[in-house]
Amino acid sequence: AWELTILHTNDVHSRLEQTSEDSSKCVNASRCMGGVARLFTKVQQIRRAEPNVLLLDAGDQYQGTIWFTVYKGAEVAHFMNALRYDAMALGNHEFDNGVEGLIEPLLKEAKFPILSANIKAKGPLASQISGLYLPYKVLPVGDEVVGIVGYTSKETPFLSNPGTNLVFEDEITALQPEVDKLKTLNVNKIIALGHSGFEMDKLIAQKVRGVDVVVGGHSNTFLYTGNPPSKEVPAGKYPFIVTSDDGRKVPVVQAYAFGKYLGYLKIEFDERGNVISSHGNPILLNSSIPEDPSIKADINKWRIKLDNYSTQELGKTIVYLDGSSQSCRFRECNMGNLICDAMINNNLRHTDEMFWNHVSMCILNGGGIRSPIDERNNGTITWENLAAVLPFGGTFDLVQLKGSTLKKAFEHSVHRYGQSTGEFLQVGGIHVVYDLSRKPGDRVVKLDVLCTKCRVPSYDPLKMDEVYKVILPNFLANGGDGFQMIKDELLRHDSGDQDINVVSTYISKMKVIYPAVEGRIKFSTGSH
């Protein structure tokens, strides 16, 4: 028998520095977690103690904090090189700055193979990107070889900016011939490493003949055997065992997100490359694990540029940006409009001639808007200003919801109106009229939404049975501020870009902004 240790991360999302327990900015260092300096310590400890170790990343290193905003992927290459990852799969967010924003900072600089079997380049891009990412890689591990085959969510064109010269094929269809190729090369130990979410990970384990282990990402799935060490609730045991169609027991793993855990899976193979046993658990990277001095010093060095960036002007406002709770928790506020407009702008994807865009709607809890921005400071808007407006380090995500769920959400928005509560929704691509004289749960008297399957966008009444795409904060997607109906009834949820980054990019693009209060939210009774 031959034993392999698989260390794995996924959806790190730019958390190079240690974070608080909820993966936001570290405040009390003695209680902080994760970060590459701490990850390095644990990885080196395991590499010293065990003979056959692979360190793998299942995608979405890009996007999530000011680190990515400033360094644009160079930080990912630098620190992943320092940690000597053995392989990485491309995630959807690796395409957030377009193909060039992937090629230059990461693909050309990485000292490890970057993989995806189901992304095919065409046209002029094919020769430019050739060899920079691979469908699979055979890695020597001790006296054996292990094949790693990569995959990426086929939804990436709707979630990021891969352009028109990359085709995202069905994962299973693309993986099978690559695995078959590895088998003909006498590689009998094969790991599928990819970024399509836990459901697809399980399908790959079930359907792709010859895959021994699946290491996934995208869905931020936390798996654990026994008592979990922090706040995350396990979605199943670690590893999650799938019985394949040809009768094999295939372990499937994922390690939550944000570098909070290091996935740790021990696999025992027989001489024919069959999995005999698999066991392990994610390792919580808490403060009991010291941060490595060399990596930490490098982090401190790179950090300086971030501090300088946060005070630079992104653009100007010529109007007061009203982000006060007195406005945003009671009525339409222009800060809410600005943020929602930025959220939609960030999701412009012309993937189908029938649609002017795949999504037109935004909702945003008023309680998530934490500060106004005064225009009387020469109109200057900085990252620091935006961090005061959006201090929670969230993301703006894409969900699919039925019209009936949206209706419930808007009823919840005003079910206890007048108490300055955070659930009052700011909107984009939506016209809503409330009648507060009616009883809670029946106050939405008009709800019109902007069409997507149209050449001239116009507002049509919401249809209860229709499925709509909506951009909203991850806080709402997870049922925050009492929006349990969104969490319970959403049909799809894909995590998006860092909230501040979305707004800052929009302001930089527009250069001068002047959002108005324009009748997106109305009240039909005389009291408003």
């Epitope: 170790v53 320092a82 000597r84 053995d86 000292k111 060399s294 010093a297 490098d298 401190n300």
Partner: antibody, heavy 120, light 111 residues
């Protein structure tokens, strides 16, 4: 366990070249830099340079850039140092030592050293 | 290049007592919040062993009787209590910048 195996001794003539080896085992060879050091009884330890086995990227001390050439053979997990135009000044113990691929990282494992004697 | 001056050149210490070796750098080896001074033990016929890195962090498998301290330009290695197995040469080394440089060494003997 991590091991860096070096031959015990080499005897060569002045004016010739020599290629010293360092065979790594017990870890992923391409995952760490390989450094070479020189120790003469009168001059202490001197850093010659380093090589990244992943892509053979090298970095030399100014003092040794015309004296030493660092190479690797990935498939055998072996690092080499070639020393050219040898003189008695090159007689020394030469160590290979591993470090994580970041400038400030320490030399965490060492070979036993090869004693090079340059003599006619 | 950063020059490291180690003192004393030799030191005799009784079993169970404290041995202190000093290392002074010609310029600061501090770098973004850390001091990159390392300490090694060298015994005849054995590969050198990393004892302490970044001034005070213990190397893997190093006994607790070895400790390091200091910052900027002044550093020390402490061994307490001294054991027979500790008879060796000790070197300091800076890894703040290349070329990496070493102290001249301290020979630790038994009194």
């Amino acid at each position: 366990q991590v091991q860096l195996q070096q031959p015990g001794a080499e005897l060569v003539r002045p004016g010739t070249s020599v290629k010293l080896s360092c065979k790594a085992s017990g870890y992923t060879f391409t995952g760490y830099w390989m450094n070479w050091l020189k120790q003469r009884p009168d001059q202490g330890l001197e850093w010659i340079g380093r090589i990244d086995p992943y892509d053979s990227e090298t970095h030399y001390s100014q003092k040794f850039k015309d004296k030493a050439i660092l190479t690797v053979h990935k498939s055998s997990s072996t690092a080499y140092i070639q020393l050219n135009s040898l003189t008695s000044e090159d007689s020394a113990v030469y160590y290979c030592t591993r470090s994580s691929p970041i400038t400030t990282a320490p030399f965490d494992y060492w070979g036993r050293g090869t004693t090079l004697t340059v003599s006619s | 290049n950063i020059v490291l001056t180690q003192s004393p050149a030799s030191l005799a210490v009784s079993l169970g007592q404290r041995a202190t070796i000093s290392c002074r750098a010609s310029e600061s080896v501090d770098y973004y919040g850390f001091s990159f001074m390392n300490w090694f033990q060298l015994k005849p016929g054995q590969p050198p062993k990393l004892l302490i890195y970044a001034a005070s962090t213990q190397g893997s498998g190093v006994p607790a009787r070895f400790s390091g301290s200091g910052s900027g330009t002044d550093f020390s290695l402490n061994i307490h209590p001294m054991e027979e197995d500790d008879i060796a040469m000790y070197f300091c080394q800076q890894s703040k910048e290349v070329p990496y440089t070493f102290g001249g060494g301290t020979k630790l003997e038994l009194k």
